[in-house]
Amino acid sequence: GELETSDVVTVVLGQDAKLPCFYRGDSGEQVGQVAWARVDAGEGAQELALLHSKYGLHVSPAYEGRVEQPPPPRNPLDGSVLLRNAVQADEGEYECRVSTFPAGSFQARLRLRVLVVLDPQEDSGKQVDLVSASVVVVGVIAALLFCLLVVVVVLMSRYHRRKAQQMTQKYEEELTLTRENSIRRLHSHHTDPRSQPEESVGLRAEGHPDSLKDNSSCSVMSEEPEGRSYSTLTTVREIETQTELLSPGSGRAEEEEDQDEGIKQAMNHFVQENGTLRAKPTGNGIYINGRGHLV
């Protein structure tokens, strides 16, 4: 004779599992009893149930109320059992041992797999839940739209910040240059540019206000290095230095003349308008703040 079973039985969590075990005997063989046991590796066999041809089904205390025989009509050679309300802990190896007369004992093993699904359907564990699927799709689309919105907002804010900065630069550039040149003209007799403290013209390293630390999960937003343009135009400090180099003489009168000459040269970069000095228009302006610091 031979014992027929399944290699793997798959059931959804909370549903009932049929553990098949059918003995196809040779002529005149009778099945005396079928014993079911849990036989996970590393652990001793744990009895589930005993199906006796004469005395019926006996279920072990650990599985009381959870193991049944399939409903009749039932083939007397069928040793299958029904495990009710499968839980995760039921997953593992099971053995069916059939005792026959006169052929002796036969045994077979199967593996029970318990699937955990979010929305189990009794109709079919493999059926796709269309509602869940559509919810996921809508969620993904919403996330993408949100990412797109974030990108647009960030780009717009960057653009506006740059615009505002450019406006401020132009405005302060005009103010500073006008103010400093006016002061220099007024106090040219008392001011020696060489005595000006060095730190007043040092470049000030400030954090770029536009720098964006992107912690979002949107892959759409890739960070690009900010494109900064470095001016090649002669700065006010350089003009002053050039002015100093023109006249190495020590006389006070010479100095005054040199100062005037320097101022004249500096004035080439400005236009007089309504009583104030304005920087000549250039495509590459430089922002010098009120303290004369270059940014």
């Epitope: 049929k18 005997g25 002529s27 083939n75």
Partner: antibody, heavy 118, light 107 residues
Framework: QVQLKQSGPGLVQPSQSLSITCTVS????????VNWVRQPPGKGLEWLGV???????DYNAAFISRLSISKDISKSQVFFKMNSLQADDTAKYYC????????????WGQGTSVTVSS | DIQMTQSPASLSVSVGETVTITCRAS??????LAWYQQKQGKSPQLLVY???NLADGVPSRFSGSGSGTQYSLKINSLQSEDFGTYWC?????????FGGGTKLEIK
């Protein structure tokens, strides 16, 4: 090879009994059970009952009171008997062997056409 | 009684096409299901047992699937000899009932 051959009357009087014999070859009745199924003309199939390899029987609950199935292992024969036939029992009656998983019917007889009429 | 609802009731298809016949049980039958083919004036023939297992001698273009209450029989690349009526049957509780049948006709 496996074969199931049926023999029985084609016409039965109302309220009378129907007896059909299914003679098998190519397998032993001690190893396999035999089912009985009927099919009214132009209609579907209806399971009536089974006699298992060990000799025990199971019947369709709707026919339990007027149906009996038995067998003679030495002659390799299965006997079907239904009492109190009416016009709506007119059908083709089949015997079929249970196979594989102990349930599905893998070999069928040629069928016996039975008409219940006076 | 467990009711077996088979669909469609009839199907008109051409040779070479693929068809799927479904059978729905009124309650869980734990894959205790068989599919049969019956030709006009002949006895039924077993195609599939245990919902998914192909019977001996049945061409591989036939396949059974399903679990719980929903089962189906698929026939790939229909041949002329595949036309006839198909039946599903459950073996879970008394009585074992058949579906209403699906008549497969040549288009």
């Amino acid at each position: 090879q496996v074969q199931l051959k049926q023999s029985g009357p084609g016409l039965v009087q109302p309220s009378q009994s129907l007896s059909i014999t299914c003679t098998v070859s190519g397998f032993s009745l001690t190893n396999y059970g035999v089912n009985w199924v009927r099919q009214p003309p132009g209609k579907g199939l209806e399971w009536l009952g089974v006699i298992w390899s060990g000799g025990s029987t199971d019947y369709n609950a709707a026919f339990i009171s007027r149906l009996s199935i038995s067998k003679d292992i030495s002659k390799s024969q299965v006997f079907f008997k239904m009492n109190s036939l009416q016009a709506d029992d007119t059908a083709k009656y089949y015997c079929a062997r249970e196979g594989y998983d102990g349930y599905a019917m893998d070999y069928w007889g040629q069928g016996t056409s039975v008409t219940v009429s006076s | 009684d467990i009711q077996m609802t088979q669909s469609p009731a009839s199907l008109s298809v051409s040779v070479g096409e693929t068809v799927t016949i479904t059978c729905r049980a009124s309650e869980n039958i734990f894959s205790s299901l068989a599919w049969y083919q019956q030709k006009q004036g002949k006895s039924p023939q077993l195609l599939v047992y245990g919902a998914t297992n192909l019977a001996d001698g049945v061409p591989s273009r036939f396949s059974g699937s399903g679990s719980g209450t929903q089962y189906s029989l698929k026939i790939n690349s229909l041949q002329s000899e595949d036309f006839g009526t198909y039946w599903c049957q459950h073996f879970w509780g008394n009585p074992w009932t058949f579906g209403g049948g699906t008549k497969l006709e040549i288009k």
